[in-house]
């Protein structure tokens, strides 16, 4: 006569997080008397999931009526599955006794939980960098299962190839995390650029998740300076302009120096924006040349985004102009954005 067999027909079951998992188990006999118990894992540390005889298991329901006479189906449904539920589940027949003793176990069913990755978070360098420099961006996503996942990097729709990706942990786990670092070479046109991290996973049904970083948060485009002397507006007055071009971000402070002495300091406010996202600004200085006996060295000094100042100088020839006696100071005015304040 055949001894009782515990049959777990499914070697593995895969369930999406939040759904219910059905674990099948049938026995071939009602002999011996005693309960069926379900465990996660094997050995002394196994976790009791359900006991037909006693206990309260709020997430577990029996698929068929376990009290029904002649019932040999001890399949269970576990509700609201999370990645922490992953593991191998064993249906075990016990023999009535004091205490009950394990009689026979099923072969086990491995439950894998399909969990979606979290939205990728892309972060750039802590400090801004200038064009031609290589900067690193990181992308992280967590909590997904199974382990297989695909990560791609894009810059303005163009796929990047210089990146390194790790999925942790290396061994078996209830859920996994991905960490990727991409290297991006900055160009002067990158103010409007975006770096995109794209994650594809079986749970996303072909709709990858994306995380973005705007290079406007990362790039610093230093300005180019040009100092020019404008035609004379009136006798003894010369208009000198400082064109500050193609800079980003907007934070900029300009100082005029006459022969090395600070004449005027101002902060860029009303700027014009270029198509590539950089800014232009212009400041001007009205110099009363009659106040100067010798040539004047005018310097436009710009401090951009907290960086060391850059400057451009212009030598103003005054020898050709008649001197106005009794005056020893230069009367000057400044202007910006080419506005004439007279």
């Amino acid at each position: 006569e055949e001894e009782l067999q515990v049959i777990q027909p499914d070697k593995s079951v895969s369930v999406a997080a939040g759904e219910s998992a059905i674990l099948h188990c049938t026995v071939t006999s009602l002999i011996p008397v005693g309960p069926i118990q379900w465990f996660r894992g094997a050995g002394p540390a196994r976790e009791l999931i359900y006991n037909q005889k006693e206990g309260h298991f709020p997430r577990v329901t029996t698929v068929s009526e376990s009290t029904k006479r002649e019932n040999m189906d001890f399949s269970i449904s576990i509700s609201n599955i999370t990645p922490a539920d992953a593991g191998t589940y064993y249906c075990v027949k016990f023999r009535k006794g004091s205490p009950d003793t394990e009689f026979k176990s099923g072969a086990g069913t491995e439950l894998s939980v399909r969990a979606k990755p979290s939205a990728p978070v892309v972060s750039g360098p802590a400090a801004r960098a200038t064009p031609q420099h290589t900067v690193s961006f990181t992308c992280e996503s967590h909590g997904f299962s199974p382990r297989d996942i695909t990560l791609k990097w894009f810059k303005n729709g163009n796929e990047l190839s210089d990146f390194q990706t790790n999925v942790d942990p290396v061994g078996e786990s209830v859920s996994y995390s991905i960490h990727s670092t991409a290297k991006v070479v900055l160009t002067r046109e990158d103010v409007h650029s975006q770096v995109i991290c794209e994650v594809a996973h079986v749970t996303l049904q072909g709709d990858p998740l994306r995380g973005t970083a705007n290079l406007s948060e990362t790039i610093r485009v230093p300005p180019t300076l040009e100092v020019t002397q404008q035609p004379v507006r009136a006798e003894n007055q010369v208009n000198v302009t400082c064109q500050v071009r193609k800079f980003y971000p907007q934070r900029l402070q300009l100082t005029w120096l006459e022969n090395g002495n600070v004449s005027r300091t101002e902060t860029a406010s009303t700027v014009t924006e270029n198509k590539d996202g950089t800014y232009n600004w212009m400041s001007w200085l009205l110099v009363n040349v009659s106040a100067h006996r010798d040539d004047v060295k005018l310097t436009c000094q710009v401090e951009h985004d907290g960086q060391p100042a850059v400057s451009k100088s212009h030598d103003l020839k005054v020898s050709a102009h008649p001197k106005e006696q009794g005056s020893n100071t230069a009367a000057e005015n400044t202007g910006s954005n080419e506005r004439n304040i007279y």
């Epitope: 006569e1 055949e2 006999s29 002999i31 009535k96």
Partner: antibody, heavy 115, light 111 residues
Framework: RQLVESGGGLVQPGGSLRLSCTAS????????ISWVRQAPGKGLEYIGT?????ITYFASWAKGRFTGSKTSSTAYMELSSLRSEDTAVYFC????????????WGQGTLVTVSS | DIEMTQSPSSVSASVGDRVTLTCQAS????????LAWYQQKPGQAPKLLIY???TLATGVPSRFSGSGSGTDFTLTISSLQPEDFATYYC???????????FGGGTKVEIK
């Protein structure tokens, strides 16, 4: 679906008897067969359950004197060293108790132990 | 071994009456629910009514119900019918396989 007992009768004290319980309409292979007796005018008394070869057990008072075996269609119980107080109607029933209760029952067979 | 005590040993009742029979175990039955009720009429084999303390057996009228857990159990016949006059036995199971013991029975007689 029924059980039919046979093998009862008159036996002398100290004698032996083999009772049979034959199933018709169902198999006994996945169920235990339990034996219960009832002395004249008395209540029911559980004797034991025959499962597979390994899984056969008897009430403490019946151990040693009563033994059992089973095929897919018939269960047997051997009664030995019989005494007058063993006189009773012997019933077999399918089931092993708890979630496999005794049902159905045979009609019973009378065993009389007397000299 | 477990011991099962039924009370009363007999009860007289009329058709339509609600009848309550009790069964007490000397210790908690196996799983707190290893308790069955059987009905026996003279010259017949017992018939299963209730198992696992409260589960109604197939084909048994719904006027029969079982309740209880641990050591104290009840069989209730909500409206006694003429065919219900019989002797009722409880069968309790202890923690060991062979520890199955019937109560002494309760005879339900016509008043």
């Amino acid at each position: 679906r029924q059980l039919v007992e046979s093998g009862g009768g008159l036996v002398q004290p100290g004698g032996s008897l083999r009772l049979s319980c034959t199933a018709s309409g169902f198999s006994l292979s996945s169920h235990g067969i339990s034996w219960v007796r009832q002395a004249p005018g008395k209540g029911l008394e559980y004797i034991g359950t025959i499962g597979t070869g390994v899984i056969t057990y008897f009430a403490s008072w019946a151990k040693g004197r009563f033994t059992g075996s089973k095929t897919s269609s018939t269960a047997y119980m051997e009664l030995s060293s019989l005494r007058s107080e063993d006189t009773a109607v012997y019933f077999c029933a399918r089931g092993s108790a708890w979630n496999d209760p005794f049902d159905p029952w045979g009609q019973g067979t009378l065993v009389t132990v007397s000299s | 071994d477990i011991e099962m005590t039924q009370s009363p040993s007999s009860v007289s009742a009329s058709v339509g009456d609600r009848v309550t029979l009790t069964c007490q175990a000397s210790q908690s039955v196996y799983g707190n629910n290893d308790l069955a009720w059987y009905q026996q009429k003279p010259g017949q084999a017992p018939k299963l009514l209730i198992y696992l303390a409260s589960t109604l057996a197939t084909g048994v009228p719904s006027r029969f119900s079982g309740s209880g857990s641990g050591t104290d159990f009840t069989l209730t016949i909500s409206s006694l019918q003429p065919e219900d006059f019989a002797t009722y036995y409880c069968l309790g199971g202890g923690d060991d396989e062979a520890d199955n013991v019937f109560g002494g029975g309760t005879k339900v007689e016509i008043k």
